[in-house]
Interface confidence: medium
Amino acid sequence: KAMHVAQPAVVLASSRGIASFVCEYASPGKATEVRVTVLRQADSQVTEVCAATYMMGNELTFLDDSICTGTSSGNQVNLTIQGLRAMDTGLYICKVELMYPPPYYLGIGNGTQIYVIDPEPCPDSD
């Protein structure tokens, strides 16, 4: 079944290559297990950036080598993506799945355009 997912249209990464945004879903039921996936769309290619399954009320657990971290509060997921460079600029789509209990729900946001600008190198000081 379909579910609405909201996320900001545009986010500018910090000079350290960190971008944060909120992914909010309109939960039609009382889900206890939720899966959140961040997808990056650039040109016609869609790639999975990171994914985490969490139990409501608990922390999101991404893989150790993931560039994502996050926290959840009710129907909101606060996502942070680190280590971004200019080449990572693109549309980052939040996909939310209510895994348990049934029925299964899927929601896909319209995407957050993340702009990443590589910092200028510091000039050498004499």
């Epitope: 079944k1 379909a2 899966r35 996936t37 997808l39 769309q41 016609s44 290619q45 869609v46 790639t47 999975e48 789509i93 996909k95 799945e97 895994m99 029925p103 299964y104 899927l106 896909i108």
Partner: nanobody, 135 residues
Framework: EVQLVESGGGLVQPGGSLRLSCAAS????????IGWFRQAPGKEREGVSC????????YYADSVKGRFTISRDNAKNTVYLQMNSLKPEDTAVYYC????????????????????????????WGQGTQVTVSS
């Protein structure tokens, strides 16, 4: 640039057959789901069939089950819709559409047909080909 080009439409008598083709360029079918949709004058666009090119899963609307068959040729980057036993109510403009598999349910088959046959699930669309079933 992603492009989908439909062909194979035309005028056919009731009970006849047609094979529609959807040629994709700008991406490979391997990771995409391709759906066929149709829109009759004054009606909403409705899902007809879909094939998930990553695992070959197929989905059909109840109105065409047993009459239409969807298939793919990854080497030609083309998806086909074989339409048999055509009826006047099959008259419509037929469109093919594509969406990356990652943007569909993680659990394949779990409510799958609902998403695969929803027009709003798809990102890329062709221009359409007219199918007219009339005697």
């Amino acid at each position: 640039e992603v492009q989908l080009v439909e062909s194979g439409g035309g005028l056919v008598q009731p009970g006849g057959s047609l094979r529609l083709s959807c040629a994709a360029s700008g991406f490979t079918l391997d990771y995409y789901a391709i759906g066929w949709f149709r829109q009759a004058p004054g009606k909403e666009r409705e899902g007809v069939s879909c094939i998930d090119s990553s695992d070959g899963s197929t989905y059909y609307a109840d109105s065409v089950k047993g009459r239409f068959t969807i298939s793919r040729d990854n080497a030609k980057n083309t998806v086909y819709l074989q339409m048999n036993s055509l009826k006047p109510e099959d008259t419509a403009v037929y469109y093919c559409a594509a969406v990356h598999g990652l943007k569909l349910p993680t659990l394949r088959g779990l409510g799958g047909s609902y998403y695969y046959l929803q027009a709003r699930s798809y990102d890329y669309w062709g221009q359409g080909t007219q199918v007219t079933v009339s005697s």
